[in-house]
């Protein structure tokens, strides 16, 4: 069919509550593209109609909920103009009762439900909740061991529980919660969350590495299209935000109206040690007014930025 | 060129019944979800009836929830509506439209008249 | 259910006028409001989707904005195909709703 295939992802995750996966795959997925979601090979799309139980809402596949015979291997074709390129995601749904301890251990999770606290620090752990803009997420509960989270040591900050001074009783089982309402309609999320205690400060220190940008200035034509990538390393069991800003604001706030220049999706790489992070920083259209401003790359307390410049003038025209 | 083409309207007595067809072309049918729309005379538009592309899932509006029924037949690329004990309020314009996940396309409608 | 309020129901411009119409969701619908144009006698036609996003074929004078409840369609400048009833309905919600529809007369 002409399709190239990127990669397989896969998800393992918990029946009878809500699940979304975005197709997103920079710069692929960055310009003009047309996004389709099948399900097992077949030849027909996943609806789009709102009320079905599985559809697709924009660029996302969405589960509300999942249940246990929605396992299988589901493709997305992202079509350009002259491209097609095909991500098959492969989802496992199992059965788990968190508070039931007779149901032995989880499969093998993904990183987001196995989260590390560091002895004697300030950490955090973060609630991993990735779903379209059609759904409302309302506040999130926290709880250790089935019992609701309490206590001067513990904040929760949007997705984020804040642990303060991190003993080895922290470790165990946790769990965080929302309610997230779709068309009306009211859903359970709730992640389980292994935590474990660790001394060491891991790879590279607990500050993130920006590879790239390097506070430099780039050279665009006025009135152009620019994709610019912000390259982050991070302990693979990091809590850190990755954005962009201007004038200390996200890009997707400042310019909240035009939507001109906008925030992408963020993508990692899992490494032995570590992992690599990538959020891309779009400019539809370069303006007079984007020169000489720096916009921000902020991945925990780093920061590096990029300037836009007016290329020279090349006399050789004249 | 997506195109949509109802017929099957026509006047009919109340508790009768009356089949609507679309016929698509254009794109690949199979690859949409579609849906029916209904406009009374002087009125506002009202979503009536949706169905996914393989067919296998249909939604309803409150009121015709029972009476109606959508359906399609992907190897004629044509959406139907059957409708059963008609009304005098279900006297409407019936559209068929593309969905995608707006009402992308439209037909140019055909009109049910219920009435004694 | 969920209820689209247009505002108002129907206006009288001028060919050059700057138009507005509003439609207010009675709750928070967080995602997007599709809009379309329906001439007498004609199927409608959709005009915008996605709050901001036009079809192929419809003019830039035609924009649309706002969240959360408040949507806005916005003619630049009317000209004098744009006389029609407009409507709003929001994307991503069940089961789908249209607003009552605003008719835009020439004064």
């Known amino acids: 069919d002409g399709c190239k295939d990127i990669f397989m992802k896969n998800e393992i995750l918990s029946a009878s509550q809500p699940f979304a996966f975005n197709c997103t795959f920079p710069p692929i997925t960055s310009g003009e593209v047309s996004v389709t979601w099948y399900k097992n090979s077949s030849k027909i799309p996943v609806s789009k109609i709102i009320q079905s139980r599985i559809h697709q809402d924009e660029t996302w596949i969405l589960f509300l909920p999942m249940e246990w015979g929605d396992s299988g291997v589901y493709q997305c074709v992202i079509k350009g103009r002259d491209s097609c390129h095909r991500i098959h995601v492969n989802l496992t749904v199992f059965e788990k009762h968190w508070c039931d301890t007779s149901i032995g251990g989880l499969p093998n999770l993904s990183d987001e439900y196995k989260q590390i606290l560091h002895l004697g620090k300030d950490d955090s752990l973060t609630c991993h909740l990735h779903f379209p803009k059609s759904c409302v997420l309302g506040p999130i509960k926290w709880y250790k061991d089935c019992n609701e989270i309490k206590g001067e040591r513990f904040t929760v900050l949007e997705t984020r529980l804040l642990v303060s001074n991190v003993s080895a009783e922290d470790r165990g089982n946790y769990a965080c919660q929302a309610i997230l309402t779709h068309s009306g309609k009211q859903y359970e999320v709730l992640n389980g969350i292994t935590v474990s205690i660790t001394e060491r400060a891991g790879y590279g220190g607990s500050v993130p590495k920006i590879i790239y940008p390097k506070n430099h200035s780039i050279e665009v034509q006025l009135g152009t299209t620019l994709i610019v990538d912000c390259n982050v390393t991070d302990t693979k069991d990091n809590t850190n935000l990755r954005c962009w800003r201007v004038n200390n604001t996200l890009v997707d706030d400042y310019y909240d109206e035009s939507k001109r220049i906008r925030e992408g999706v963020e993508t990692h790489v899992s490494f032995r040690e570590h992992n690599l992070y990538t959020v891309n920083i779009t400019f539809l259209e370069v303006k007079m007014e984007d020169y000489g401003l720096p916009f921000m790359c902020h991945a925990g307390v780093s920061t590096a930025y990029i300037i836009l410049q007016l290329p020279a003038p090349d006399f050789r025209a004249y | 060129e997506v195109q949509l083409l109802e017929s099957g309207g026509g006047l009919v007595q109340p508790g009768g019944s009356l089949r609507l067809s679309c016929a698509a072309s254009?794109?690949?049918?199979?690859?949409?979800?579609m849906s029916w729309v209904r406009q009374a005379p002087g009125k506002g538009l009202e979503w009536v009836s949706a169905?996914?592309?393989?067919?296998?899932?249909?939604y309803y509006a409150d009121s015709v929830k029972g009476r109606f029924t959508i359906s399609r037949d992907n190897s004629k690329n044509t959406l139907y509506l059957q409708m059963n004990s008609l009304r005098a309020e279900d006297t409407a314009v019936y559209y068929c439209?593309?969905?995608?996940?707006?009402?992308?396309?439209w037909g140019q409608g055909t009109l049910v008249t219920v009435s004694s | 259910d969920i209820q689209m309020t247009q505002s108002p129901s129907s206006l009288s411009a001028s060919v050059g006028d700057r138009v507005t119409i509003t439609c207010r969701a009675s709750?928070?619908?967080?995602?997007?409001v599709n809009w379309y144009q329906q001439k007498p006698g004609k199927a409608p036609k959709l005009l915008i989707y996605?709050?901001?996003k036009r079809p192929s074929g419809v003019p830039s004078r035609f924009s649309g904005s706002g969240s959360g409840t408040d949507f806005t369609l916005t003619i630049s400048s009317l000209q004098p195909e744009d006389f029609a009833t407009y409507y709003c309905?929001?994307?991503?919600?069940?089961?789908?709703?249209f607003g009552q529809g605003t008719k835009v007369e020439i004064k």
């Open positions: 709750q928070s619908i967080s995602s997007y």
């Open positions: 996605q709050n901001d």
């Open positions: 439209a593309r969905l995608a996940p707006e009402f992308d396309y």
């Open positions: 254009g794109f690949t049918f199979s690859d949409y979800d």
């Open positions: 169905i996914e592309g393989a067919g296998s899932d249909t």
């Open positions: 309905q929001p994307s991503f919600y069940f089961p789908y709703a």
